[in-house]
Interface confidence: low
């Protein structure tokens, strides 16, 4: 369930990668403290190739016994990154992805960063903070978003094809005006989906059609003029 009390912040960094974080500043923490601890799981869509920072519950580090990040990625053994304050030790188990690291020293900052986010980072990330007051959890269902590549062309008389190639999740395609349409989805091994919608307009007073592509990374509309010449193509990429 999305955690509506947490604002998604996006900023441009000097390395030209957008950076996303669900962390809150201290003022927000004091206002939302009890709510943050109650709302344990956050569904978080993140664009591929951006940087992401995942945060632990807002617990004072001085009260800490152990911090553990559990990372469960599809098709891989569960990775755990743990820090024990008493001995100032960090330990990693089954963690092979060098793009997933502590933001800084865990005794100073318990957050985790992914630099940059790749399609393989789809999964569940969970911070468990063990304190004398109990265990506090925050989990993220990280959904990596891939912007589809769009093409629109005419392939036969009064028939147009709109493709949203290799998007994640699958894009949705709609047409204005509505035609006689068939939509097909092709699934790729990396988790992306190509959606292809082919439409035919019998009505001859329809000269321009619009393909509207809806996707979590943003919506886009492409239009094309229907030419009477069979086989004529026009790209509106």
């Amino acid at each position: 369930q999305p955690n509506n009390s947490l604002m998604l912040q996006t900023s441009k960094e000097n390395h030209a990668l957008a950076s996303s974080s669900l962390c809150m500043d201290e003022k927000q923490i004091t206002q939302n403290y009890s709510k943050v601890l109650a709302e344990v799981n956050t569904s978080w869509p993140v664009k591929m190739a951006t940087n992401a920072v995942l945060c632990c519950p807002p617990i004072a580090l001085r009260n800490l016994i152990i911090i553990t990040w559990e990372i469960i990625l599809r098709g891989q053994p569960s990775c755990t990154k743990a820090y024990r304050k008493e001995t100032n030790e960090t330990k990693e188990t089954n963690c092979t992805d060098e793009r997933i690291t502590w933001v800084s020293r865990p005794d100073q900052n318990s957050d985790l960063q992914i630099r940059p986010v790749a399609i393989t980072h789809d999964g569940y990330y969970r911070c468990i903070m063990v304190t004398p007051d109990g265990n506090f959890h925050r989990g993220y269902h990280l959904q990596v978003l891939v912007t589809p590549e769009l093409t629109l062309f005419q392939n036969r008389n009064r028939t147009a094809v709109c493709k949203a190639v290799a998007g994640k999740p699958a894009a949705q395609i709609s047409w204005i005006p509505e035609g006689d349409c068939a939509t097909k989805q092709e699934y790729w091994s990396n988790g992306t989906v190509t959606v292809k919608s082919t439409c035919h307009w019998e009505v001859h007073n329809v000269s321009t059609v619009t393909c509207h592509v809806s996707h979590l990374t943003g919506n886009k509309s492409l239009y094309i003029e229907l030419l009477p010449v069979p086989g004529a193509k026009k790209s509106a990429k």
């Epitope: 559990e70 569960s78 569940y124 969970r126 063990v130 004398p132 007051d133 109990g134 265990n135």
Partner: antibody, heavy 120, light 108 residues
């Protein structure tokens, strides 16, 4: 020997209160440990009542028992207590304490149980 | 509140047979599930933690599997001493550590 020893059986009248104790021995009664209370009515399943953070005294009570249960601890005697008030016949059960350490060592040590009978 | 549903409620099994007990959580609890064995007039005994890790001193015929919402306790080659009631318990969140309803295993 690492153990949790609970107080003896009690018979109470409806409306009364009962206070059950659980004394820890053989391990350090310190931060990071929690003591949970679980009850079991005759012929029924286990029911989680709540727990107390040994180091801090922080409390988590199951919603069902909110307002009727009080859990306390005495670090000097390594003892935790569970008091249940406004007793009714359906509170007749064996009450267990159990030690819980974080996620790595959960609920691995249990007391022998204390039978509380509520009868008029 | 996370609800754990155990099935079956009762199982009558002959020795050496395989026993499978399932526990379903109403929402994902990752691998934070415990399995206990309880014999009459005894305290529960921890068998398995983190869904699949055998507790100390537990015979290897016991095993656990699953994560998220669906979990299984398996007893391979049941022995007479395994007659007991088995419970699952969620320990995903410290504020609610509820149990499943229990499965009574009887020896035929």
């Amino acid at each position: 020997q690492v153990q949790l020893v609970q107080s003896g059986a009690e018979v109470k009248k409806p409306g009364a209160s009962v206070k059950v104790s659980c004394k820890a021995s053989g391990f350090s009664f310190s931060s990071g440990y929690y003591m949970a209370w679980v009850r079991q009515a005759p012929g029924q399943g286990l029911e989680w009542m709540g727990l107390i953070g040994v180091g801090s005294g922080s409390l988590w009570y199951a919603q069902k028992f909110q307002g009727r249960v009080t859990m306390t601890r005495d670090t000097s005697t390594s003892t935790v207590y569970m008091e249940l008030s406004s007793l009714r016949s359906e509170d007749t059960a064996v009450y267990y304490c159990a030690r819980h350490f974080a996620l790595s060592d959960p609920f691995n040590l249990w007391g022998q149980g204390t039978l509380v009978t509520v009868s008029s | 509140e996370i609800v754990l549903t155990q099935s079956p409620d009762f199982q009558s099994v002959t020795p050496k047979e395989k026993v499978t007990i399932t526990c379903q959580a109403s929402e994902s609890i990752d691998s934070y599930l415990l399995w206990y064995q309880q014999k009459p007039d005894q305290s529960p005994k921890l068998l398995i933690k983190q869904a699949s890790t055998l507790a100390s001193g537990v015979p290897s015929r016991f095993s656990g599997s699953g994560s998220g919402t669906d979990f299984t306790l398996t007893i391979n080659s049941l022995e007479a001493e395994d007659a007991a009631t088995y419970y699952c318990q969620n320990y995903y969140d410290i504020s609610s550590n509820d149990f499943g309803g229990g499965t009574k295993v009887e020896i035929k």
